[in-house]
Interface confidence: medium
Amino acid sequence: QPDAINAPVTCCYNFTNRKISVQRLASYRRITSSKCPKEAVIFKTIVAKEICADPKQKWVQDSMDHLDKQIQTPKP
């Protein structure tokens, strides 16, 4: 889970080791701050949990692409 140190900077120290289905994801944000030990993606899930993921993993990249497309194509 993400950890806020000296808010507003939020850092990830561990990544999830389980793929999360895109059907359970609501949004994401990238963590690129030099104050954090590693680059990360924080997914927000449909049940409001925030999960740290490794941006180098393919499923993470695919999930971000999927969420980007959802934003670009609003539901009628």
């Epitope: 359970r24 899930t45 449909i46 049940v47």
Partner: antibody, heavy 119, light 108 residues
Framework: QVELVQSGAEVKKPGSSVKVSCKAS????????ISWVRQAPGQGLEWMGA????????HYAQKFQGRVTITADESTSTAYMELSSLRSEDTAVYYC????????????WGQGTLVTVSS | DIVLTQSPATLSLSPGERATLSCRAS???????LAWYQQKPGQAPRLLIY???SRATGVPARFSGSGSGTDFTLTISSLEPEDFAVYYC?????????FGQGTKVEIK
């Protein structure tokens, strides 16, 4: 260690309601969901519905829609399942089970509550 | 709703034999969100496998799961006396969640 403790056996008349409780200990209650699953005598498992306290979501199987209400009280770490308009076919063991809201496998189960519907 | 069909309904085997249980879904279970449970008489079900192939904590290595999409398998490599029970598959990608009807593994 996570433990789910359910209320005791009930005998009910047809047409009445039953409310089964499921008290959780050993985990962060609001971070998890609770599913309710029933098992009629000699039959398989049947998913009834679920609640995710963190998001306030409830989901019900269509078969039970309108007859079942699942609630949760975070202050006591207790989930409840109320089934109304009982009929003899509702005689079953009712289980609560915990799931992680992100995923969904049922990793911890209550001991079960036998509900007998008989006139 | 996703219908899960388990086969066979009953499997009669001897201790030490290999058990192969099948679970077929009526539509794809995305991201392999499928679990297997073991249930013994008078007891609550116990989680064995989640995400189709990951063993739950404390589950012996003789239990393994495989499959994706619509076809899933639970394998018990060498049956121990305590493995004779009913096994259920469960999909948790969609609401409503659904269970298979169960496979009973009995002593031959």
């Amino acid at each position: 260690q996570v433990e789910l403790v359910q209320s005791g056996a009930e005998v009910k008349k047809p047409g009445s309601s039953v409310k089964v409780s499921c008290k959780a200990s050993g985990g962060t209650f609001s971070s998890y969901g609770i599913s309710w699953v029933r098992q009629a005598p000699g039959q398989g498992l049947e998913w009834m519905g679920a609640i995710n306290p963190l998001a306030g979501h409830t989901h019900y199987a269509q078969k039970f829609q309108g007859r079942v209400t699942i609630t949760a009280d975070e202050s006591t770490s207790t989930a409840y399942m109320e089934l109304s308009s009982l009929r003899s076919e509702d005689t079953a063991v009712y289980y609560c089970a915990r799931y992680d809201g992100i995923y969904g496998e049922l990793d911890f189960w209550g001991q079960g509550t036998l509900v007998t519907v008989s006139s | 709703d996703i219908v899960l069909t388990q086969s066979p309904a009953t499997l009669s085997l001897s201790p030490g034999e290999r058990a192969t249980l099948s679970c077929r879904a009526s539509q794809s279970v995305s991201d392999a969100y499928l679990a297997w449970y073991q249930q013994k008489p008078g007891q609550a079900p116990r989680l064995l496998i989640y995400d189709a192939s990951s063993r739950a904590t404390g589950v012996p290595a003789r239990f393994s799961g495989s499959g994706s999409g619509t076809d899933f398998t639970l394998t018990i490599s060498s049956l121990e006396p305590e493995d004779f029970a009913v096994y259920y598959c469960h999909q948790y990608i969609f609401y409503p969640n659904t269970f298979g009807q169960g496979t009973k593994v009995e002593i031959k």
